[in-house]
Interface confidence: medium
């Protein structure tokens, strides 16, 4: 199960089957390498755990948008 992997993930072979609440998410990166079997998003949680997610799912897109907005508008 990829969401139990703590070493840096370079490719995703499986996606998490549950939505992760945005409060848990610290950052994300996209995996688009042709060496990987599928396009993916890797979320880093607030306890530095990496989780593979399907970029086609709406909650994944919404979470990426949320994180992008945070970076653009830091808290005073």
């Amino acid at each position: 199960q990829p969401d139990a992997i703590n070493a840096p993930v370079t490719c995703c072979y499986n996606f998490t089957n549950r939505k992760i609440s945005v409060q848990r998410l610290a950052s994300y990166r996209r995996i688009t390498s042709s060496k990987c079997p599928k396009e993916a998003v890797i979320f880093k949680t607030i306890v530095a755990k990496e989780i593979c997610a399907d970029p086609k799912q709406k909650w994944v897109q919404d979470s990426m948008d949320h994180l992008d907005k945070q970076i653009q508008t830091p808290k005073p």
């Epitope: 703590n6 840096p8 609440s21 998410l25 610290a26 994300y28 880093k44 607030i46 970076i71």
Partner: antibody, heavy 122, light 112 residues
């Protein structure tokens, strides 16, 4: 105001078990990870592990596998740490803590309980 | 596990003077997401630890700007520009990049 209120000091016999509690107010524990940290007398801090109260997922530092069991009850907004087969090495202060937005540019916060002293007597 | 080594063990500083604490990790704390999960906490006498700094240099809410964190890779520093009486206690660096999360041994700041 966010607070983590921990249960009172425990004096327990060697070989017994003890269950500590950490009750949160001002936030919902199921929106955060809850961590436990050990501090032996006059020593540094050791991370025990975390629990995701929403689904019960846990991750333990290898040293505490089999020694510590973390659980949570979202209805009472409380996290628990059970320590088993106690020895003098387990005499310590145990802290619960939580943080959110750790690792984002948005900001961060971290809260700690006041600690629970566990004394193991032979 | 990642080893976190802090120096000095004890620091004796006059109020109003600067202070500096070093923290070295046994492996780079630069994560694959480009972030460095290095934090500093202060434990005042008889109190719980309190996080001061996360992500190397970001100050937690309410932490005075006399505290600054810096560094990269394996070498990190916490600086206090002018020590005040409330700053005494034990300072810990800790990392969240690698599992399991690990703490430094602590640096005790004493007031001269």
């Amino acid at each position: 105001e966010v607070q983590l209120q921990q249960s009172g000091a425990e004096l327990v016999r060697s070989g017994a078990s003890v269950k500590l509690s950490c009750t949160a107010s001002g936030f919902n524990i199921k929106d955060n990870y809850m961590h436990w940290v050990k501090q032996r007398p006059e020593q540094g801090l050791e991370w025990i592990g975390w629990i995701d109260p929403e689904n019960g997922d846990t991750e333990y530092a290898p040293k505490f596998q089999g020694k510590a069991t973390m659980t949570a009850d979202t209805s009472s907004n409380t996290a628990y740490l059970q320590l088993s087969s106690l020895t003098s090495e387990d005499t310590a202060v145990y802290y619960c803590n939580t943080w959110a937005y750790y690792g984002t540019s948005y900001g961060g916060f971290a809260y700690w309980g006041q600690g629970t002293t566990v004394t193991v007597s032979s | 596990d990642i080893q976190m080594t802090q120096t000095p063990l004890t620091l004796s500083v006059t109020i109003g003077q600067p202070a500096s604490i070093s923290c070295k990790s046994s492996q780079s704390l630069l994560d694959s997401d480009g972030k460095t999960y290095l934090n500093w906490s202060l434990q005042r006498p008889g109190q719980s630890p309190k996080r001061l700094i996360y992500l190397v240099s970001k100050l937690d809410s309410g932490v005075p700007d006399r505290f600054t964190g810096s560094g990269s890779g394996t070498d990190f520093t916490l600086k206090i520009s002018r020590v005040e009486a409330e700053d005494l206690g034990v300072y810990y660096c800790w990392q969240g990049t690698h599992f399991p999360q690990t703490f430094g041994g602590g640096t005790k700041l004493e007031i001269k």
